[in-house]
């Protein structure tokens, strides 16, 4: 049967009269509706905005639409003891002090609730002592310090700028480093493009913005207090000493304008080379401490903010399929903001809602889809991915065997220049065929398909005529659906033409500028990227909840895994005595991959062959498809993170944004030259070979034939 | 049984250049990633080059870079290492690896003037 005879509608019901039906217009009068007062979670104005979206989607046509609450920890600053930095002469009196706000933007002097910037989870305290520049403060940063330059971090406090890793990991390499406090800024070579006005002007990042953020090291976790389990009300929370993630040394962002009057008096050692100079006026010493002069000074780190358990909310629709009620598809994003949210999250939200507003209108008109689609507007997303945890926590042994695919829908932008795209392999020919459907809105590629333009703008790196797809990481909200429970999912936006800062973000990302208007005037000002978007997303949640065999293609896995399996593998053969000596071999993995290539090709034909009107057969083949992606948990997790249980991809252990393969043995691997047992250490690396061995060996059988 | 097998050593001048050649059989060899390593007279084993199941996926030590091209061709069984601009540091022996356990016997490159 077509999927038109399957769900019993008329034939003009199909994906075109879907897409056909999303409009630029109404995603840029929900994108204002969205933006015009903070949103904070846990605040009375994110609540009133959870009912209005609950109270609209049903509106829309949702079955049902439910809000699903939780109490999790959250972060405040103290709203009458401000968190600031000063420079403090050798009498200790503060001679200068950091900004207490960002100022506000025009048309927006007059809103309350602006929270001040600040690191969220940052625990009180007011250490004292001399600076250390750490550049980026990842792994490397404090290799090349400790190592090369030996310079000890032990009791200093360290700046870094932000960009290239998630702020979490700055702040545990600079806590493993033994630094008492950390000072986060934003350097203009990172948030400042050459040739752009600063806002209100351009979509640059001014002298006083500063990024908010949290600075957890959840690995996965969820709520701090609840880990592995929902923040209902009759949880069990452990105490604050054993909370999971939380920093043990204060933290505090600031923008350029104030990283300058700390920066221009650093001393001690010149920087290592050009790679650690940005963009301001100053050496880029590194320290310690202030050069001659100003020798006596000091920098002082003020911060009161104040860890609450506070009440989130996440609104839940449901759109009940007609055919397969009981197999899930989820279109997820998150509704809390730093600040207005213009571009995060409230550029992806306007697009959920408009995705939701074309299925209801469809569904008005008799269509149902053949699965169950699930619509969530997260909370607390900026707390540590808390709404989507939690309900996921609550929900999992649904989701675990009901599961077919989640697609996430944050910011819709973070530049207008092409597609970008994060997804598993499964998903691979499902992008491809859609985008090629797709028009492009890209200038120049008028007529043109939306995979030509995405092709020619970000080509794959291995195949010719293809577009660059990436790994999923981390750092939003398919992280418990993918990474713990194994659930199919993808991401999709349009991103910037900056491949070299790609897990910085945009100039204003989660300052007070990031407004309506910058979206309006400078990004997108006929919402033509994030129709697009809305089209890609909303297409693949059509598809996967439509299509009669699920359009996953195991073929894809197979390719991966052999590139993956080969890059691991040069990666331990650069210590081939080691190798040589404890008798590493990759045999076995390589074995496993082979198998499972040979396997997923055999299940590709029967997939062709097979009688689609047999309703047990297809639902049979389609659980062998779901499946898949859950044959890559190991239940007992990585090491050290038991909520990142995928074998294949894990976020990386120096940077939640990035993805990693093979990450269990990846990180065995990771500067094993330093181990002080190198039998053990070599020893872990066998160990995870097996478990990836294994693993791949064991999601090759879930696609043999069953009997 | 798997058996690799290096040819292609030999004395050479330096910036002179030397093709490598590695015949396998034993086993599936477009299932595997290989690697040349080389052991320079009294020094330990360096990692050298690796290649994936193609020749698009390919890696080289930061010392060979740009001059060292790994290839395969999976059709005779057979991994090389185009080696140009040679110098006197890079004389060892080479052997070809599959898997991490299982190395050629290797072939002795001689640079010298």
């Known amino acids: 049967k077509s999927s038109n005879e399957a769900t019993n509608i008329t034939p003009k019901h199909n994906m075109k009269a879907f897409l056909d039906e999303l409009k630029a217009e109404n995603i840029k009068k929900f994108l204002y509706n969205f933006t015009q007062i903070p949103h904070l979670a846990g605040t009375e104005q994110n609540f009133q905005l959870a009912k209005q979206i609950q109270s609209q989607w049903k509106e829309f046509g949702l079955d049902s639409v439910e809000l699903a609450h939780y109490d999790v920890l959250l972060s405040y600053p103290n709203k009458t003891h401000p968190n600031y930095i000063s420079i403090i002469n050798e009498d200790g009196n503060e001679i200068f002090n950091t900004s207490l706000f960002e100022p506000p933007p025009p048309g927006y002097e007059n809103v309350s609730d602006i929270v001040p910037p600040f690191s969220a989870f940052s625990p009180q305290g007011m250490p004292e002592g001399d600076l250390v520049y750490v550049n980026y403060a990842r792994t490397e940063d404090f290799f090349k310090l400790e190592r090369d330059m030996k310079i000890n971090c032990s009791g200093k406090i360290v700046i870094a700028r932000y960009g290239k890793v998630f702020r979490g990991n700055k702040v545990k390499n600079a806590q493993l480093a033994g630094a008492k406090g950390v000072i986060l800024y934003s350097d203009p070579a990172d948030y400042f493009a050459p040739g752009v006005k600063s806002y209100p002007d351009g979509w640059n990042l001014p002298g006083g913005g500063v990024q908010r953020g949290n600075i957890l090291n959840l690995n996965g976790a969820g709520d701090p207090l609840t880990p592995g389990y929902p923040a209902n009300e009759y949880a069990y929370r452990r105490g604050i000493a054993e909370a999971v993630g939380l920093p043990s040394i204060p933290v505090h962002p600031i923008g350029y304008y104030d990283a300058q009057k700390l920066l221009e008096k650093m001393g001690g050692s010149a920087p290592p080379d050009s790679s650690w100079r940005g963009s301001l006026k100053v050496p880029y010493n590194v320290g310690p401490g202030f050069t001659g002069n100003f020798s006596t000074q000091k920098v002082k780190m003020h911060i009161h903010s104040t860890n609450e358990v506070t009440r989130i909310y996440n609104v839940i629709g449901t759109l009940r399929g007609a055919v397969e009620p009981d197999r899930y598809v989820i279109l997820g994003g998150h509704r809390d903001s730093w600040v207005f949210g213009g571009i995060d999250p409230q550029s992806g939200a306007a697009v959920v809602h408009e995705i939701v507003r074309s299925f209801g209108t469809l569904k008005k008109e008799g269509w149902r889809p053949r699965r169950t689609i699930l619509f969530a507007s997260w909370d607390a997303e900026e707390f540590g991915l808390l709404g989507s945890t939690e309900w996921a926590e609550e929900n999992s042994r649904l989701l675990q065997e009901r599961g077919v695919a989640y697609i996430n829908a944050d910011s819709s932008i973070e530049g207008n220049y092409t597609l970008r795209v994060d997804c598993t392999p499964l998903m691979y020919s499902l992008v491809h065929n859609l985008t090629k459907e797709l028009k492009s809105p890209d200038e120049g590629f008028e007529g043109k398909s939306l995979y030509e333009s995405w092709t020619k703008k970000s080509p794959s790196p291995e195949f010719s005529g293809m577009p660059r797809i990436s790994k999923l990481g981390s750092g939003n909200d398919f992280e418990v659906f993918f990474q713990r429970l194994g659930i199919a999912s993808g991401r999709a936006r349009y991103t910037k033409n900056w491949e070299t800062n790609k897990f910085s973000g945009y100039p204003l990302y989660h300052s007070v500028y990031e407004t309506y208007e910058l979206v309006e005037k400078f990004y997108d000002p006929m919402f033509k990227y994030h129709l697009t978007v809305a089209q890609v997303r909303g297409g693949m949640v059509f598809e996967l909840a439509n299509s009669i065999v699920l359009p996953f293609d195991c073929r894809d896995y197979a390719v991966v895994l052999r590139k993956y399996a080969d890059k691991i593998y040069s990666i331990s053969m650069k210590h081939p005595q080691e190798m040589k000596t404890y008798s590493v071999s990759f045999d076995s993995l390589f074995s496993a991959v082979k198998n499972f290539t040979e396997i997923a090709s055999k299940f590709s034909e029967r997939l062709q062959d097979f009688d689609k009107s047999n309703p047990i057969v297809l639902r049979m083949m389609n659980d062998q498809l779901m499946f898949l992606e859950r044959a890559f948990i190991d239940p007992l997790g990585l090491p050290d993170r038991p909520f990142y249980r995928h074998v294949i991809y894990a976020p990386s252990s120096h940077n939640k944004y990035a993805g990693e393969s093979f990450p269990g043995i990846y990180d065995a691997l990771f500067d094993i030259e330093s181990k002080v047992d190198p039998s053990k250490a070599w020893g872990e690396v066998k160990r995870q070979i097996y478990v990836a061995a294994f693993t791949v060996q064991a999601a090759a059988e879930t696609l043999s034939e069953v009997a | 049984e798997v058996q690799l097998l290096e040819s292609g050593g030999g004395l050479v001048q330096p910036g002179g250049s030397l093709r490598l050649s590695c015949a396998a059989s034993g086993f599936s060899f477009s299932s595997y990633a290989l690697s040349w390593v080389r052991q320079a007279p009294g020094k330990g084993l360096e990692w050298v080059s690796s290649?994936?199941?193609?020749?698009?996926?390919?890696d080289y030590a930061d010392v060979v870079k740009g001059r060292f091209t790994i290839s395969r061709d999976n059709s005779k069984n057979t991994l090389y290492l185009q080696m140009n601009s040679l110098r006197v540091e890079d004389t060892a022996v080479y052997y070809c690896?599959?898997?991490?356990?299982?190395w050629g016997q290797g072939t002795l490159v001689t640079v010298s003037s």
């Open positions: 290649i994936g199941e193609n020749n698009a996926t390919t």
């Open positions: 690896v599959k898997d991490g356990v299982h």
